[in-house]
């Protein structure tokens, strides 16, 4: 029985050239988290946080992705192409997989502000 819920930063916007924090939080379950996968809209893996092995940032993103804070991910030097969906997937036992979705909009305008409100998708 999957009782947990994933809370995410929901829909966020950030400035081109700036950075943004992608955050997911798993709550309402006692399941063990063995790994968290971060994926981009085209399903390519950005990073993995394994409970035993720690962080692995995939080579294509090494220059622009920083691990943390916590199980989150920091995207740096944002470009317009970074606009899109991001997914966090929690591998847990005995519950299985939980998936959260974040939509990032990268804006040219200096008006863009990073909103870090938590939402349940």
């Amino acid at each position: 029985m999957m009782t947990g819920t994933i809370e995410t930063t929901g829909n966020i916007s950030a400035k081109k050239g700036g950075s943004v924090i992608l955050q997911c939080h798993l709550s309402s379950t006692m399941a063990q988290v063995t790994q968290v996968n971060w994926e981009q809209h085209d399903h390519s893996l950005l990073a993995i946080r394994n409970a035993e092995l720690g962080w692995h940032i995939y080579p294509a993103f090494k220059d622009r992705v920083a691990p943390g804070p916590g199980l989150g991910l920091t995207l740096q030097s944002l470009t317009m192409n970074d606009t899109g969906e991001y997914f966090c997937t929690y591998h847990t036992y005995p519950d299985g997989t939980y998936r959260g979705r974040i939509f990032l909009e990268v804006l040219e305008s200096s008006v863009a502000e990073h909103s870090a409100r938590f939402q349940i998708p």
Partner: antibody, heavy 119, light 107 residues
Framework: EVQLVESGGALVKPGGSLKLSCAAS????????MSWVRQTPEKRLEWVAT????????YYPDSVKGRFTISRDNAKNTLYLQMSSLRSEDTALYYC????????????WGQGTSVTVSS | DFQMTQTTSSLSASLGDRVTISCRSS??????LNWYQQKPDGTVKLLIY???RLHSGVPSRFSGSGSGTDYSLTISNLEREDIATYFC?????????FGGGTKLEIK
């Protein structure tokens, strides 16, 4: 080239014990979770156990929980399955497989070792 | 537990045919569906993971699709080396259950 070679299969009596081994090569063993999967005489596949890369986490289906123990020796690149209180329904071909959490799948399998539980 | 059902246990087709093998889960598995190929000698290989993603080294004639509870594996141009039994498996929630398999034979 990823290689997984199982051994230790045998004919055992009901209630008996057996330890299976799986020798891994061609990849950094300590970086991967590993699993045992069995194939029954009726050709059905059943997941039996999974162990995390460092061995801290082990997972089992209810059918084998408390009777089977998965373990690993990362220094020896070897995966184990200790089976006790064996039953006739444990008769199967036992495969070891690499469990890739980034794929949510078992990406490489061994050739299997046969376990027969019969009096 | 999630029950995985492959309604067709055996399938006969001719070389060059387009073959589709189906798999149904008892609950929504959110595309965490894998396909494995078992050759007559017992060798097992991962073909497709996460419903539609081809594992490395797998020929492009293999493809996967589906969502929710219904999934399928398609071989677009059947070759002799494709003669095998195909199993689906859900990777969403333990226990990681498999379908009963579909044995593919040549007509």
């Amino acid at each position: 080239e990823v290689q997984l070679v199982e051994s230790g299969g045998a004919l055992v009596k009901p209630g008996g014990s057996l330890k299976l081994s799986c020798a891994a090569s061609g990849f950094t063993f300590s970086n991967y979770a590993m699993s045992w999967v069995r194939q029954t005489p009726e050709k059905r596949l059943e997941w039996v156990a999974t162990i995390s890369s460092g061995g801290s986490y082990t997972y089992y289906p209810d059918s084998v929980k408390g009777r089977f123990t998965i373990s690993r020796d990362n220094a020896k690149n070897t995966l184990y399955l200790q089976m006790s209180s064996l039953r006739s329904e444990d008769t199967a071909l036992y495969y070891c497989a690499r469990w890739l959490l980034s794929l949510y799948a078992m990406d490489y399998w061994g050739q299997g070792t046969s376990v027969t539980v019969s009096s | 537990d999630f029950q995985m059902t492959q309604t067709t246990s055996s399938l006969s087709a001719s070389l060059g045919d387009r073959v589709t093998i189906s798999c149904r889960s008892s609950q929504d598995i959110s595309n965490y569906l894998n396909w494995y190929q078992q050759k007559p000698d017992g060798t097992v290989k991962l073909l497709i993971y996460r419903t539609s993603r081809l594992h490395s080294g797998v020929p492009s004639r293999f493809s996967g699709s589906g969502s929710g509870t219904d999934y399928s594996l398609t071989i677009s141009n059947l070759e002799r080396e494709d003669i095998a039994t195909y199993f689906c498996q859900q990777g969403k929630t333990p226990p990681y259950t498999f379908g009963g398999g579909t044995k593919l034979e040549i007509k």
